[in-house]
């Protein structure tokens, strides 16, 4: 599609006659009518194939026509065509006399023809104007004339079609040739794609206007290189997306459990010296005059007795003191004034003469001690519980309370979490310094094995392009979560995404 | 636990400005990126803002670009939204949520509301 | 942006009774949905992620299936902790764009 455009500048007929050499009364007031057609070696009369068009009276006998001349002419002449430019044409200019003022043929007598000149050739589509000038015996036209493109036309001969646009559809201009030139941050055939924010990650980031960075589920950051833990994960981290693994200290599917516990809460007081031990478990060894699971607990000095002979003992600012029975002295009444003859050894304990009577011995029956037999034994009295356990005499033996995780007789052993068969539906449990896991049977699931899920129909790894596979639990079938840029029930189909 | 406490909603009037402010804890703040999600009164919710872990990058939805600006301080556990130029529109509770555009908000605040009203 | 639907906006039921909630989007959304629970004047809570992942801690009579662009989620037997409001949500698209929520009431 585009326009042949014919520009008159002069016409010259000074005698002012007619074709046949009569001349015009009062004088040749003179019009135009222009034929454009197809190219033909010899130009005959026949239809205007390529259009045609007619001037109002542009003057009388000679006269130059100026652009757009007025009384409702247009210079240069238009003459649009809707096809593809051939490259070569036929162009016919008739000058006409008119008498009066209708110029339609009908209303013209054949005689009032100035002048008719034919000319045909080559012509490329260009903004330079050919210059041509015509003579006859009695007159001289000048004129020029080009083709050239109707708006939104490109190319040689006018065929492309090409119009600028900045929507959904595409963010370009036009180029002389009617290429599409994309305006800045767009690229793609019709510049409808995006150019990302520079470094943005090709797989992991898109976009969907310039210089942004859109990530793809389970990526974050300005460029989606950073990949997002699991939903449910606490203190983790990941290397791809929807990992969660742990930082120091910390165990369990997500994170949550905690194995230094003593890091984390400093449970153990006055002090003591903290032990982890397992998950949310701590052994507290404590200062000396501290006891208790935390060792929050003050002792007393005389908590330990240190009173011998039936000495009772007081607590000081700076310690204690003994206060001795008959017969006793010393710092803990451990030097006696008796001999056998008093009969110093109690709780049937027996008297054997020292030193010739000056000093005694007494041999004690078992759970009694002291050097006259006056205390009970106390087998706690070397904190022979490991990991916090309490100590208890039972007679002549003792026993150990253990906490809970612990066993044996000096709870010197941690309790297994497999001990009690936590894993239900014939699960495998194995022991872990994070707790427990259980390895369940097909058709079971959950961290005890608990949830009944038919069969893993993901056993067979149904899912293509790292999809995720999920066990539909209603149908015992698989169901894949597909990657950005693939479809189908196997995630097999690639396509292009993100879709606008 | 996982905890989300915001802070900082009130009374402003139209054009004014308000922070609020999101205290977490319960799990390692830095690595995760985390959204404020908004809720006007009697309506469905509606995504405001995300920023990532640790580069911080920002994303907002189109009516309040220019005007809040989501920030944390992974020293603190801390995430904040800078709320200027409020409007009528912008009356809702705002919740502090775990999870980023392009992901499910997987634990949220209490939430804080904010009122803009003359 | 993505339009999500939820179908119905409302709907009554009684404890023990199996329920269903429709959620549409506008175009395909690849399975990245997730559903929340929100009981009045309170936070909302994740139950299912990528379309039928249960979020920890969630009971199993929660359940989501669904893909392209219709998703489900359903409650196989009420309890009267879950009369509530559900909203859906897609993370495939930026912006991510909720349902307009579904209040599920005692018959």
């Known amino acids: 599609s585009g326009v042949f455009q014919l520009q008159l500048q002069e016409f010259v007929n000074e005698r002012g006659v007619l074709a046949s050499g009569r001349p015009c009364e009062p004088g040749c007031r003179t019009f135009f009518r222009v034929c454009l057609k197809h190219f033909q070696a010899v130009v005959s009369p026949g239809p205007c194939t390529f259009g045609s068009v007619s001037t109002p009276v542009l003057g009388t006998n000679s006269f130059a026509v100026r652009d757009d001349s007025s009384g409702g002419g247009r210079n240069p002449l238009q003459l649009p065509f809707n096809f593809t430019w051939p490259g070569t044409f036929s162009l016919i200019i008739e000058a006409w006399h008119a008498p009066g003022d209708d110029l339609r043929p009908e209303a013209l007598p054949p005689d009032a023809l100035i002048s008719k000149i034919a000319i045909q050739g080559s012509l490329a589509v260009g903004q330079n104007w050919l210059l041509d000038e015509q003579t006859s015996t009695l007159t001289r036209l000048r004129y020029s004339y080009r083709v050239i493109c109707s708006d939104n036309y490109y190319g040689d001969n006018c065929s492309r079609l090409c119009k600028k646009r900045n929507d959904h559809f595409g963010h370009y201009v036009c180029q002389p040739d009617g290429n599409l030139s994309c305006l800045p941050g767009w690229t793609g055939e019709y510049c409808q794609q995006p150019i990302c924010l520079s470094g943005c990650h090709e797989q992991n980031g898109y976009c969907s206007k310039p210089a942004e960075c859109l990530c793809r589920p389970g990526w974050q950051g300005r460029l989606c290189n950073e990949c997002i833990p699991h939903n449910g994960c606490r203190h983790g981290t990941c290397s791809t997306p929807w990992q969660c693994t742990c930082d120091e200290g910390w165990g369990g599917l997500f994170c949550d459990q905690d194995l230094n516990y003593c890091t984390h809460h400093s449970p153990c007081k006055n002090g003591a010296t903290c032990s982890n031990s397992g998950q949310r478990s701590y052994t507290c060894t404590c200062r000396p005059g501290y006891t208790g699971v935390d060792c929050e607990l003050e002792l007393s000095e005389c908590d330990s007795n240190p009173c011998r002979n039936g000495g009772s003992c007081k607590d000081q600012e700076d310690g204690y003191h003994c206060l001795c029975p008959p017969g006793y002295y010393g710092l803990h009444c451990e030097h006696s004034t008796l001999s056998c003859a008093d009969s110093p050894c109690f709780n049937g304990g027996s008297c054997r003469e020292r030193n010739q009577g000056a000093s005694y011995a007494c041999e004690c029956p078992p759970n009694f001690t002291g050097s006259n037999c006056e205390k009970k034994v106390d087998r706690c009295t070397s904190n022979p519980c490991a990991n916090g356990g309490q100590c208890l005499n039972r007679g002549p033996s003792r026993m150990c309370r253990c906490r809970p995780g612990f066993t044996g007789t000096y709870c010197e052993r941690h309790v297994s979490d497999c001990a009690r068969n936590p894993c239900a539906h014939g699960g495998t449990c194995h022991d872990l310094e994070s707790g427990l896991m259980c390895t369940c049977p097909a058709g079971f699931s959950g961290r005890r094995c608990e949830v009944r899920t038919s069969i893993d129909a993901c056993a067979s790894s149904p899912c293509f392009n790292r999809a995720t596979c999920y066990t539909d639990l209603s149908t015992d079938t698989f169901v894949c979560n597909c990657p950005y840029g693939f479809v189908g029930s196997r995630c097999e189909f690639p396509v292009g995404l993100p879709p606008s | 636990e996982v905890q989300l406490v915001e802070s900082g909603g009130g009374l402003v009037q139209p054009g004014g400005s308000l922070r609020l402010s999101c205290a977490a804890s319960?799990?390692?703040?830095?690595?995760?990126?985390m959204a404020w999600v908004r809720q006007a009164p009697g309506k469905g919710l509606e995504w405001v803002a995300t920023i990532s872990g640790s580069d911080e990058w920002p994303n907002y939805r189109d009516s309040v670009k220019g005007r809040f600006t989501i920030s944390r301080d992974n020293a603190k556990n801390s995430l904040y939204l800078q709320m200027n130029s409020l409007r009528a529109e912008d009356t809702a509770v705002y919740y502090c949520a775990r999870g980023y555009y392009n992901s499910p908000f997987a634990f949220w605040g209490q939430g804080t509301l904010v009122t803009v009203s003359s | 942006d993505i339009q999500m639907t939820q179908s119905p906006s409302s709907l009554s039921a009684s404890v023990g009774d199996r329920v269903t909630i429709t959620c549409r989007a506008s175009q395909e959304i690849y399975r990245n949905l997730a559903w929340y629970q929100q009981k009045p004047g309170k936070s909302p809570k994740l139950l299912i992620f990528d379309t039928s992942v249960l979020a920890d801690g969630v009971p199993s009579r929660f359940s989501g299936s669904g893909s392209g662009t219709d998703s489900t989620l359903t409650i196989s037997s009420l309890q009267p902790e879950d009369f509530a409001t559900y909203y859906c949500q897609q993370y495939t698209y930026y912006p991510p764009t909720f349902g307009q929520g579904t209040k599920l009431e005692i018959k």
């Open positions: 319960g799990f390692t703040f830095r690595y995760f990126p």
